[in-house]
């Protein structure tokens, strides 16, 4: 399986909410002995590998923001901790999973990574990740709403987020 990032760049005004999204692609084993561990973190475009370093999002670690379930089951973080920081991660039945960040500030700008670990019990782990950039802007040049830019594999025309 692979992870796709529908949008590689999100440009948002300060104070706005944004939902960053990743999507699981390819065959997904729904066997009872396969589990998916999904999480989010901030990172940097490292020399060795993008998304290798795992930094907190608003002081919450990837351990705090994880989702865990089998196959394409839906799940979301119910952590009061995450919600107190204006964060919520969620996953649906179609392989989409996301993190919503509320009331954006300039400090939220940076590289964000989604990580999916396919746990094949009695065998091994398989990990894949996706990366996207968030730019939070302020002042007269800032957009009125978030503007999202599709990843290069998709249509290059920018789409305004609802």
């Amino acid at each position: 399986f692979k992870v796709a990032t529908p949008y590689s760049l999100y440009v948002c005004p300060e104070g706005q909410n944004v939902t960053l999204t990743c999507r699981l692609l390819g065959p997904v084993d729904k066997g009872h002995d396969v589990t998916f561990y999904k999480t989010w973190y901030r990172s940097s475009r490292g020399e060795v590998q993008t998304c290798s370093e795992r930094r907190p999002i608003r002081n919450l670690t990837f351990q705090d923001l994880h989702l865990h379930h089998g196959g394409h089951q839906a799940a979301n973080t119910s952590h009061d901790l995450a919600q107190r920081h204006g964060l919520e991660s969620a996953s649906d039945h179609h392989g989409n999973f996301s993190i919503t960040m509320r009331n954006l500030t300039l400090l939220d700008s940076g590289l964000y990574c989604c990580l999916v670990v396919e746990i094949r019990h009695h065998h091994s782990e398989h990990r894949v990740h996706g990366a996207m950039e968030l730019q939070v802007q302020t002042g007269k040049d800032a957009p009125s709403n978030c503007v999202v830019y599709p990843s290069s594999s998709q249509d290059s025309e920018n789409i305004t987020a609802a």
Epitope: T35, V48, Q49, R54, Q63, G70, V117, I119, E125
Partner: antibody, heavy 117, light 107 residues
Framework: QVQLQESGPGLVKPSETLSLTCTVS????????WSWIRQPPGKGLEWIGH???????NYNPSLKSRVTISVDTSKSQFSLKLSSVTAADTAVYYC???????????WGQGTMVIVSS | EIVLTQSPATLSLSPGERATLSCRAS??????LAWYQQKPGQAPRLLIY???NRATGIPARFSGSGSGTDFTLTISSLEPEDFAVYYC?????????FGGGTKVEIK
């Protein structure tokens, strides 16, 4: 802050079963792997096995025939049973949280188990 | 199973010196390798994950490098509290395995 605490007998007779429990406090046991690792006196670390919160287990092949790891999410505990012990099983036994695609990030302080008659 | 071989077994150095510890895997573990520090009477503590990333709260004098089968943990300038035993550990597949350890002792 998540903390782990091992408990169980410090002395076990040869051929008997070693039983240890690890209590998880300050966080949920309903995610991650929960591992047992041991360290014989003056030697290195050996991974015994782990259990996922869902109940799936993986064991070190060298111990598999004698090991059982179980979890009780209602009590936030997971347990180790090692049967037919010998003096070679004398070690400090650690429980640890094992994050998928990461590492053992939180450890108990360890409990010494001596196998002797 | 994957065998991790650490060298040297013992490293005798003085505070302020640079320590270089090696970990070699019997087959490729990609970059899925962690390093731990253990002091007498204590549980191990995570230092480095995924070969080169420092865990939370670990000082910048600790750095990891390598991929595939050869890995290095470097302590740029030894502090008194760094004298301990260091273990590498792979997680590319199960069973999870540790190296035999390198003891860094005061010269």
């Amino acid at each position: 802050q998540v903390q782990l605490q091992e408990s169980g007998p410090g002395l076990v007779k040869p051929s008997e079963t070693l039983s240890l429990t690890c209590t998880v406090s300050g966080g949920s046991i309903s995610s991650y792997y929960w591992s047992w690792i041991r360290q014989p006196p003056g030697k290195g670390l050996e991974w015994i096995g782990h259990i996922y919160y869902s109940g799936s287990t993986n064991y070190n092949p060298s111990l598999k025939s004698r090991v059982t790891i179980s979890v009780d999410t209602s009590k936030s505990q997971f347990s180790l049973k090692l049967s037919s012990v010998t003096a070679a099983d004398t070690a400090v036994y650690y429980c640890a949280r094992d994050i998928p695609a990461f590492a053992f990030d939180i450890w108990g302080q360890g409990t010494m188990v001596i196998v002797s008659s | 199973e994957i065998v991790l071989t650490q060298s040297p077994a013992t490293l005798s150095l003085s505070p302020g010196e640079r320590a270089t510890l090696s970990c070699r895997a019997s087959q490729s573990v990609s970059y899925y390798l962690a390093w731990y520090q253990q002091k007498p009477g204590q549980a191990p503590r995570l230092l480095i994950y995924d070969a080169f990333n420092r865990a939370t709260g670990i000082p910048a004098r600790f750095s990891g490098s390598g991929s595939g089968t050869d890995f290095t943990l470097t302590i740029s300038s030894l502090e008194p509290e760094d004298f301990a035993v260091y273990y590498c550990q792979q997680r590319i597949n199960w069973p999870l395995t540790f190296g035999g350890g390198t003891k860094v002792e005061i010269k």
